[in-house]
């Protein structure tokens, strides 16, 4: 009876999400393997988040708009492990917008989800950020490693979206 009611709840939750995401990929987790965590197909999952690499070229504002249409934000990177996971799926000759900007050019960087900007957990390339006119951040491959660079926000780039996993 308990299992039946849990299944019914799951099905109704799935139907609720189906109007936003035609397909979800779910895995069982939790200590009793009773919880399902899901990401929209074909997003990838890492820890408690889902990630989508957008290969369409857009300005930073449009990229954030595009992520929000999908119920996400431009990616906020909190750890080196998270960055290493994300970069496995990136092309080394491309650049991708992050959810990090300096709107006034005062070198006050801020994440789109209001996560505090911690200078100790940043992965800027050597010598970056280097211009107060470049107010948006990308991740790209340079000098044999992935890192961040400040760029002009209006020049189109690819982007990375991030959202919380859906639990059912």
């Amino acid at each position: 009876n308990f299992m039946y009611s849990k299944t019914v709840k799951r099905l109704s939750k799935l139907q609720e999400y189906q109007q936003y995401y035609p397909s979800l990929t779910c895995v069982m987790e939790g200590k009793d393997m009773e919880d399902w965590s899901c990401c929209p197909t074909p997003w990838t999952s890492f820890q408690s988040s889902c990630y989508f690499i957008s290969t369409v070229m857009q300005s930073w504002t449009k990229s954030q708009n595009n992520c929000s249409v999908m119920g996400a934000d431009l990616v906020v990177i909190n750890t080196k492990e998270e960055q290493d996971f994300i970069t496995q799926n990136l092309k080394i000759n491309s650049a991708y917008f992050l959810g990090l900007s300096d709107p006034k050019g005062w070198r006050h960087w801020q994440w789109v989800d209001q996560t505090p900007y911690n200078k100790n957990v940043t992965f800027w390339h050597s010598g970056e950020p280097n211009s107060p006119d470049e107010r948006c951040a990308i991740i790209n491959f340079r000098s044999e490693e992935w890192g961040w660079n400040d760029v002009h926000c209006h020049v189109p780039q690819k982007s990375i979206c991030k959202m919380k996993k859906i639990y059912i």
């Epitope: 369409v56 070229m57 857009q58 300005s59 504002t61 449009k62 708009n65 249409v69 650049a95 006119d133 760029v151 002009h152 926000c153 209006h154 020049v155 189109p156």
Partner: antibody, heavy 120, light 107 residues
Framework: DVQLQESGPGLVKPSQSLSLTCSVT?????????WNWIRQFPGNKLECMGY???????YYNPSLKNRISITRDTSKNQFFLSLNSVTTEDTATYFC?????????????WGQGTLVTVSA | DIQMTQSPASLSASVGETVTITCRAS??????LAWYQQKQGKSPQLLVY???TLADGVPSRFSGSGSETQYSLKINSLQPEDFGNYFC?????????FGGGTKLEIK
Amino acid sequence: DVQLQESGPGLVKPSQSLSLTCSVTGYSITSAYYWNWIRQFPGNKLECMGYISYDGSNYYNPSLKNRISITRDTSKNQFFLSLNSVTTEDTATYFCVRGGDYDDGGFAYWGQGTLVTVSA
Amino acid sequence: DIQMTQSPASLSASVGETVTITCRASGNIHNYLAWYQQKQGKSPQLLVYNAKTLADGVPSRFSGSGSETQYSLKINSLQPEDFGNYFCQHFWIIPYTFGGGTKLEIK
């Protein structure tokens, strides 16, 4: 005020390469923005061909496959279009255009255009 | 690529009349639409960006409207200098494609 000026041969033979120069005055092409080539066919249809960004990175319209290259000479504040293996279908007026104005919402600065005819 | 369908292809009107040109996108372009005017032998001139904002120096008789996939350019009280070709262009995702154009002629 920024000004763009196209130059290059007006007549190119089929199968040869088309090469055009855009000279920019009033703004450094390495400071910001992205620098486009757009063409207009005889029936007035417009096509974005590709661009070179202020940082030197490129985008090319997939419809032009591997025929297109856009490069620059920062010392002369110029950028260039090279289109290989041209056919009569490449006959058009070619414009150089600055991109990224109005938070990338419209192209405000255009060259006056140069007509290129592909003919034997 | 997003396709832009512009109509009508041509239009005859008299000075003082009001005309409307429409543009339909094959997908939602989130108001990232520009309108241009082009005179014979000249380069296109930006009139409107972000669907409804007039570019610098554009007279207030021009106005843009629309959302999602449907957009229009309205010209009130046509002036002799308004005749020429008009193009729409989306600015949502690269490549930014143009409509086929509307030729506005004097009746």
